[in-house]
C-alpha cells in the first residue's frame, strides 16, 4: 500500500492556556522508521515530538503508538501559549542502517493559531 501521511486539518484555532490535538494518520508503517512532528520547514524547523518514549513537557501522543498496527500519530499540546503558533508537520522517516534516517513523506501541515484568552 502506498504510504500517505494525512493531516486532515489545514488549521486549528486554540485559546491560550487550552489544549489542542494535531491529527496525523498513516496508510502504512512501511518502510520501517520513525515518525516525527516538526514546527516549520527547512533547516530552521523545530523538532516537537518523536514518539521515542522520551518525556516532552505539554505534549502527549493521543493513541498508543506501541500497538502493532497503530496508524495514528496524533499529538495533544497542552497549555498552549502564543509561542506555540506556527505550522506543524507530521513527517515519516525511513530508518538508516549506518547513515541518518531519510525523510520520505510528510503531511500537508496544520497551522496552529493561538487566540488571546
Amino acid at each position: 500500500k502506498e504510504l500517505k501521511v494525512t493531516q486532515p486539518e489545514k488549521s486549528v484555532s486554540v485559546a491560550a492556556g487550552d489544549s489542542t490535538v494535531l491529527n496525523c494518520t498513516l496508510t502504512s508503517l512501511l518502510p520501517v522508521g520513525p515518525i516525527r512532528w516538526y514546527r516549520g520547514v527547512g533547516p530552521s524547523r523545530l523538532l516537537i515530538y518523536s514518539f521515542a518514549g522520551e518525556y516532552v513537557p505539554r505534549i502527549r501522543n493521543v493513541s498508543d503508538t506501541t500497538k502493532r498496527n497503530n496508524m495514528d500519530f496524533s499529538i495533544r499540546i497542552s497549555n498552549v501559549t502564543p509561542a506555540d503558533a506556527g505550522i506543524y508537520y507530521c513527517v515519516k522517516f525511513q530508518k538508516g542502517s549506518s547513515e541518518p534516517d531519510t525523510e520520505i513523506q510528510s503531511g500537508g501541515g496544520t497551522e496552529v493559531y493561538v487566540l488571546a484568552k
Epitope: K10, S11, S13, V41, G42, Q105, G108, G109, E111
Partner: antibody, heavy 119, light 108 residues
Amino acid sequence: DVQLVESGGGVVRPGESLRLSCAASGFTFSSSDMNWVRQAPGEGLEWVSLISGSGEITYYADSVKGRFTISRDNSKNTLYLQMNSLRAEDTAIYYCAKENNMYRFFDYWGLGTLVTVSS
Amino acid sequence: ETVLTQSPGTLSLSPGERATLSCRASQSVYTYLAWYQQKPGQPPRLLIHAARNRAAGIPDRFSGSGSGTEFTLTISSLQSEDFAVYYCQQYYDRPPLTFGGGTKVEIK
C-alpha cells in the same frame, strides 16, 4: 455551480483606499478558506492574503502587511479586501480564490477586478 | 519562503506535439504542488493538484509528475485550446503560498 464575482476595483491615486468585494455562491462559504491573489499587468500570480472559514485566522504577504485587511461576512457569503495606503506597485487584477477543503491550493477563481493606482 | 522556478519561460510548439514544462522548488515540497492554466483575459484554472492528480474535467492529455523539488507538467498532444500560460504553485511551506513565474506555451 461555484461562482465567485469580484467588484470594487477602479482607478485611485497613491495613498488612497479601496475596498474589494467577492460574492460567493454554489458552495458552503462559511466552511471554506478564501484568498486574494493578484496579477500585475503582464506579470505572474502573487498570493496576497488568506482568511479561514470562521474568519479567525488571517495571513498576508509581506508586500501588503499593515496596509491590507482581509475579512468576510458569512451571513452574506461575501469576502472583502480593504486596501489602504495604495501604491503604484499594487496595480493589478485582484482575484478571489476558493481553497480546496483539505489543502491550500485553489480550486475555483473569480474573474477578477482591476485596481489601478496612478497619479 | 519556497521559491519556484519554471522553465522554459516560453515554449514554441505546433499542435499535436508534446509539451514538457518544468517547475523546480528551492526546497522539498513533497507532492504539495498544483498546476494552473491561464488564457488571456481569463482567471487561472486548476489543472493538477498533489503533483499528479488531475482536477475534475481536465482531459487526460495533461499529466503531472515529480516530488520533492522537481516537477513536470506534460501535455501529450497539444490542442489549439492548450496554448496558454502555465503556473505551478506550492502549498507545503506557507505562508506565503508561492507561484512559479509561469511558462508560456505558444504556437510555433
